[in-house]
Interface confidence: low
């Protein structure tokens, strides 16, 4: 379920690279503070090639007896990434990929980057952070979006093709106006779609046809003036 | 030897308490041990009461004994309470303590349990 | 809350028979389940944590295996000494950690 009382901040880094954060300020803490560790897990859409910063519950650092970040990857082991204060000890075990890493000392700060994210990052991230008080959770179920590559021709007599080529999840197609709609998924061994539709117009006054791809990280309206002449193509890329 | 010991059956009646303690010994009582209390009534399942974090005194109780129970800790004596007030007969159960430290060894421990009778 | 339903509620089975015992979880708990065995007048004993890791010194005819909401626990090859009731228990979050309802384990 997503955790509404989160805002997702999005900064131009140097590097370039859009930088996406689910923590909070300090004031934003001691103001929702109990609903914070109320909402254990939170849905989090992400954008690949960007930089992700996961946050541990609000709890303060000195109250820590062991920080442990469980990181669950399809078709992987369990990964975790082990703090305990007493010994100022880190255990990494499962761990192979060297983008997800701490974002300074455990000790420090208990936060977890992910420079870039790739498709592979799809899965739940989980922080469990034991204190004197108890075991507080907060996890992420990461879900690493994929702009879809768009395409739009015409392929046949008052017939137009509209592309979403790998994206992830899946774009939806729609048409203005409505013709005799087919479309198709093909799925991708690396977790992205790419949806086709394929409509006929019969109606001869209509000349100009819009498709419309809606994706998560984004809309996008593409138009064709559709030729009477067979075969002809026109990208509208 | 580690182990909870608890105190002794208790009969009471109804609208009454009662306290149960649970009594740590062989291992250090301290901060990252919660100590939970569960209760199991006559021929039925396990049910789980709340528990209190050792070095805190911080607490959790299920939703069902809300504002009805009470838990407590004697670090001097390593000893855990749990109160339970406006007893009814459906209270009549055997009371558990358990230790948990943490999602590393959950659980791992048990009292041998305190048989508590509600009756009129 | 997270709820927990355990199934079956009874099993009659012979000995060196495999017994399986299945506990689902209303909502995710990755892999924060426990798997209790208790007989009767005594308290439960911890078999399993974290869905599949054996607790100390319980035999390894006893296993566990799930994640997320459907876990599983298997006795191969049952003895007499196994008759009891079993209970798997969310461990989650620490706000919260019920016990499924029980399934009785008896020997023909």
């Known amino acids: 379920q997503p955790n509404n009382s989160l805002m997702l901040q999005t900064s131009k880094e140097n590097h370039a690279l859009a930088s996406s954060s689910l923590c909070m300020d300090e004031k934003q803490i001691t103001q929702n503070y109990s609903k914070v560790l109320a909402e254990v897990n939170t849905s989090w859409p992400v954008k690949m090639a960007t930089n992700a910063v996961l946050c541990c519950p609000p709890i303060a650092l000195r109250n820590l007896i062991i920080i442990t970040w469980e990181i669950i990857l399809r078709g992987q082991p369990s990964c975790t990434k082990a703090y305990r204060k007493e010994t100022n000890e880190t255990k990494e075990t499962n761990c192979t990929d060297e983008r997800i890493t701490w974002v300074s000392r455990p000790d420090q700060n208990s936060d977890l980057q992910i420079r870039p994210v790739a498709i592979t990052h799809d899965g739940y991230y989980r922080c469990i952070m034991v204190t004197p008080d108890g075991n507080f959770h907060r996890g992420y179920h990461l879900q690493v979006l994929v702009t879809p590559e768009l395409t739009l021709f015409q392929n046949r007599n008052r017939t137009a093709v509209c592309k979403a080529v790998a994206g992830k999840p899946a774009a939806q197609i729609s048409w203005i106006p409505e013709g005799d709609c087919a479309t198709k998924q093909e799925y991708w061994s690396n977790g992205t779609v790419t949806v086709k539709s394929t409509c006929h117009w019969e109606v001869h006054n209509v000349s100009t046809v819009t498709c419309h791809v809606s994706h998560l990280t984004g809309n996008k309206s593409l138009y064709i003036e559709l030729l009477p002449v067979p075969g002809a193509k026109k990208s509208a890329k | 030897q580690v182990q909870l010991v608890q105190s002794g059956a208790e009969v009471k009646k109804p609208g009454a308490s009662v306290k149960v303690s649970c009594k740590a010994s062989?291992?250090?009582?301290?901060?990252?041990?919660?100590m939970a209390w569960v209760r199991q009534a006559p021929g039925q399942g396990l049910e789980w009461m709340g528990l209190?974090?050792?070095?805190?005194?911080?607490?959790w109780y299920a939703q069902k004994f809300q504002g009805r129970v009470t838990m407590t800790r004697d670090t001097s004596t390593s000893t855990v309470y749990m109160e339970l007030s406006s007893l009814r007969s459906e209270d009549t159960a055997v009371y558990y303590c358990a230790r948990h430290f943490a999602l590393s060894d959950p659980f791992n421990l048990w009292g041998q349990g305190t048989l508590v009778t509600v009756s009129s | 809350e997270i709820v927990l339903t355990q199934s079956p509620d009874f099993q009659s089975v012979t000995p060196k028979e495999k017994v399986t015992i299945t506990c689902q979880a209303s909502e995710s708990i990755d892999s924060y389940l426990l798997w209790y065995q208790q007989k009767p007048d005594q308290s439960p004993k911890l078999l399993i944590k974290q869905a599949s890791t054996l607790a100390s010194g319980v035999p390894s005819r006893f296993s566990g295996s799930g994640s997320g909401t459907d876990f599983t626990l298997t006795i191969n090859s049952l003895e007499a000494e196994d008759a009891a009731t079993y209970y798997c228990?969310?461990?989650?979050?620490?706000?919260?950690?019920?016990f499924g309802g029980g399934t009785k384990v008896e020997i023909k």
């Open positions: 062989g291992f250090s009582f301290s901060s990252g041990y919660y």
């Open positions: 209190i974090g050792v070095g805190s005194g911080s607490l």
């Open positions: 228990q969310n461990y989650y979050d620490i706000s919260s950690n019920d």
